[in-house]
């Protein structure tokens, strides 16, 4: 049993890091493998992650972490029984994938304006809370070409757009994702999408 693709990990910079790797053949990850991880820090304890299958030869493990900060560095040991298959390290702050925003809501009761709001996925005491920027994707269910991205570079988790910038009388969907420049993160996953019917009064033509 050998590792074909070494583990690569990403952290949500809060409580979970996800590591994925591939074996050289079909593997029952949860029964055959264990990923041991330990913070390189005084008094830290070793933890064991039981991996799940991710395709025939792929494995994935969700590592639970406390109080993630930029100085943290973890040792990783991948074991098959008594055999050490791979040894590595992981610095969560260097491989951040933020959590997806939640609670995306479209408020259509403001005159001729659409207000989209969502929730910041981090608590106020997390460093990323004040450093996320967002991308909002709006698309038409009827017209695949009607697809747009709005970049929200301010801190407030909201976006206002004129209803007239979208077609009237048809349904639209929106979703939002986040990233943080400070840690050069990847984009988060998209939030679940929300749907609304866009209708506004056309201006009266003389």
């Amino acid at each position: 049993m050998k590792v074909l693709q070494e583990p690569t990990c990403v952290s949500d910079y809060m409580s979970i890091s996800t590591c994925e790797w591939k074996m050289n053949g079909p593997t029952n990850c949860s029964t055959e493998l264990r990923l041991l991880y330990q913070l390189v820090f005084l008094l830290s304890e070793a933890h064991t992650c039981i991996p799940e299958n991710n395709g025939g030869a792929g494995c994935v493990c969700h590592l639970l972490m406390d109080d993630v900060v930029s100085a943290d560095n973890y040792t990783l040991d991948l074991w098959a029984g008594q055999q050490l298959l791979w040894k590595g390290s992981f610095k969560p702050s260097e491989h951040v994938k933020p959590r997806a925003p939640g609670n995306l809501t479209v408020h259509t009761n403001v005159s001729d304006t659409l207000l989209l709001t969502w929730s910041n996925p981090y608590p106020p005491d997390n460093y990323l809370y004040n450093h996320l920027t967002y991308a909002v994707n709006i698309w038409s269910e009827n017209d695949p070409a009607d697809f747009r991205i709005y970049n929200v570079t301010y801190l407030e988790p909201s976006l206002r757009i004129a209803a007239s910038t979208l077609k009237s009388g048809i349904s639209y969907r929106a979703r939002v994702r986040a990233w943080a420049q400070c840690y050069n993160t990847t984009w988060s996953e998209w939030s679940p999408s929300t749907k609304w019917h866009n209708s506004y009064r056309e201006p009266f033509e003389q």
Epitope: L42, L43, E45, D66, D67, V69, S70, A71, D125
Partner: antibody, heavy 116, light 111 residues
Framework: QVQLVQSGAEVKKPGASVKVSCKAS????????MHWVRQAPGQGLEWMGI????????SYAQKFQGRVTMTRDTSTSTVYMELSSLRSEDTAVYYC?????????WGKGTLVTVSS | QSVLTQPPSVSAAPGQKVTISCSGG????????VSWYQQLPGTAPKLLIY???KRPSGIPDRFSGSKSGTSATLGITGLQTGDEADYFC????????????FGTGTKLTVL
């Protein structure tokens, strides 16, 4: 919000021991290390040691080895610092402080006076 | 005995800028991150800067931190009378056993 509530002021005689408590609330108690830091009157901050509330393991500054004991009670989310063989130079305000590499939150401090 | 050295005192007028230095060694500041604490008279220390240059939520951007080699600097702009306090730098040292040294402390007076 995070709160670290420390026990009240103590007056002790030289050679005695003192036990200071620090009750934590507003966060997951076992997820954050706790430091103890003291400050003698008009002096700077001095690190005494650290405890991992999850397993209870500890590490102490070399200066206090053999005289200090840090413990925790997870059922009450409380950490304790006991200092023995007290001398007049131990007169100080003793702080508990939550954090790992740095101290995010501090208790208000407990004044321990050692006097004959 | 502090292994991090700070000036005993600094002073400046309201609205001015002041910097406080913190000098250490390769086994502490040179190999770790620096934090800064503000201690107002009669109160417990409060985290001002961590990770060399990051501010906890609620700390105004008048406060900044930087690190170069084995030294660190705290900067305060737009000085206010409420900034009058003692300031301590802190880090950790893994040279022999893990320890958390603090700086000697700097008294800031707002004139």
């Amino acid at each position: 919000q995070v709160q670290l509530v420390q026990s009240g002021a103590e007056v002790k005689k030289p050679g005695a021991s003192v036990k200071v408590s620090c009750k934590a609330s507003g966060y997951a108690f076992t997820s954050y290390y706790m430091h103890w830091v003291r400050q003698a009157p008009g002096q700077g901050l001095e690190w005494m040691g650290i405890i991992n509330p999850r397993g209870g393991s500890t590490s102490y500054a070399q200066k206090f080895q053999g005289r200090v004991t840090m413990t925790r009670d997870t059922s009450t989310s409380t950490v304790y610092m006991e200092l023995s063989s007290l001398r007049s130079e131990d007169t100080a305000v003793y702080y508990c402080a939550r954090g790992k590499y740095w101290m995010y939150d501090w208790g208000k401090g407990t004044l321990v006076t050692v006097s004959s | 005995q502090s292994v991090l050295t700070q000036p005993p005192s600094v002073s400046a007028a309201p609205g001015q800028k002041v910097t406080i230095s913190c000098s250490g060694g390769s086994s502490n500041i040179g190999n770790s991150y620096v934090s800064w604490y503000q201690q107002l008279p009669g109160t417990a220390p409060k985290l001002l800067i961590y990770d060399n240059n990051k501010r906890p939520s609620g700390i105004p951007d008048r406060f900044s931190g930087s690190k170069s080699g084995t030294s660190a600097t705290l900067g305060i702009t737009g000085l206010q009378t409420g900034d009058e306090a003692d300031y301590f730098c802190g880090t950790w040292d893994t040279s022999t056993v893990w320890e958390w040294p603090f700086g000697t402390g700097t008294k800031l007076t707002v004139l």
